[in-house]
Amino acid sequence: KESCDVQLYIKRQSEHSILAGDPFELECPVKYCANRPHVTWCKLNGTTCVKLEDRQTSWKEEKNISFFILHFEPVLPNDNGSYRCSANFQSNLIESHSTTLYVTDVKSASERPSKDEMASRPWLLY
């Protein structure tokens, strides 16, 4: 029998390599059984996760899972960093793994590094 606890499906140590100026949607996949929980995004600052209050978010519903989306329109260099989503469920706070955005500000698409290069060249990142 599947658990009816809320589950947040962000992979541990997940990373996204994205380009400043582009739109980007950061998804927090949420599984729940009955009432949809209240979900928020925060950005890690050292060991503290600072709640993102005034950011555009939305829900996308699919058959077996819902997605709480943090919108970047557009991505800015200072969006670089690690993010976490959290759900309030029956007075419990459930936290996802953090996911890291690596933002690069190259001038043209032809200069964009590959995902592998992004992972191995942190000096490219803001």
Partner: antibody
Framework: EVQLVESGGGLVQPGGSLKLSCATS????????IHWVRQASGKGLEWIGR????????KYAASFKGRATISADDSKNTAYLQLNSLKTEDTAVYYC????????????WGQGTLVTVSS | DIVMTQSPDSLAVSLGERATINCKSS???????????LNWLQQKPGQSPKRLIY???KLDSGVPDRFSGSGSGTDFTLTISSLQAEDLAVYYC?????????FGQGTKLEIK
């Protein structure tokens, strides 16, 4: 039934390349990280790197950076390891392993495929 | 890179007796999420590795409860409470807290 089946091993000339496949079934590859690990005869396990099939992000051990490429095709539930500039010391059994990325709920290993680098 | 050092390199234990394998990491494996990503793998002769234990002490499904894992920070232990003939294998610890992920050198468990 969960399965990881590696293929593509065999005899390769020094300086040559190989591309190994890891066909998975019984789970959604996008929910996992795919690792490639090798083991020379009578030796221990050596981590080559890992791929996130959900977005293509890849990490490598330093000794394989620039020489190894790990990728995945989630539509085929299959992962790949390409290794270039092969040397005799690359002779080993190559394993793929699939570890669930969210809650560590499973960690499956394939049976391995033997690669022999020799002239 | 994090160095994982297992002891002993080999171990001979009588059937029904307790077997203990140690694994020491060169730095803490405690992740920033408060969890410790330390696995134990079993590799029987001629077979591929199999995950026995993850997150230091959680047993994979189907793993007999004579296996247990313990430890924290940099020091970890795999214990087999009552050795069975089918436990003859090489055991590896593996950390996947810090990149690059690294294995211990392995401990060969033999029947005395």
């Amino acid at each position: 039934e969960v399965q990881l089946v590696e293929s593509g091993g065999g005899l390769v000339q020094p300086g040559g390349s190989l591309k190994l496949s890891c066909a998975t079934s019984g789970f959604n590859i996008k929910d996992t990280y795919i690792h490639w690990v090798r083991q020379a005869s009578g030796k221990g396990l050596e981590w080559i790197g890992r791929n996130d099939p959900a977005n293509g992000n890849t990490k490598y051990a330093a000794s394989f950076k620039g020489r190894a490429t790990i990728s995945a095709d989630d539509s085929k539930n299959t992962a790949y390891l390409q290794l270039n500039s092969l040397k005799t010391e690359d002779t080993a059994v190559y394993y793929c392993a699939s570890y669930e990325g969210y809650y560590e709920r499973f960690g499956y290993w394939g049976q391995g495929t033997l690669v022999t680098v020799s002239s | 890179d994090i160095v994982m050092t297992q002891s002993p390199d080999s171990l001979a234990v009588s059937l029904g007796e307790r077997a203990t394998i140690n694994c020491k990491s060169s730095q803490s494996l405690l992740d920033r999420d408060g969890k410790t990503y330390l696995n134990w793998l079993q590799q029987k002769p001629g077979q591929s590795p199999k995950r026995l234990i993850y997150l230091v002490s959680k047993l994979d499904s189907g793993v007999p409860d004579r296996f247990s894992g313990s430890g924290s920070g940099t020091d970890f232990t795999l214990t087999i409470s009552s050795l069975q003939a089918e436990d003859l294998a090489v055991y590896y610890c593996w950390q996947d807290t810090h990149f690059p992920y690294t294995f211990g050198q392995g401990t060969k468990l033999e029947i005395k």
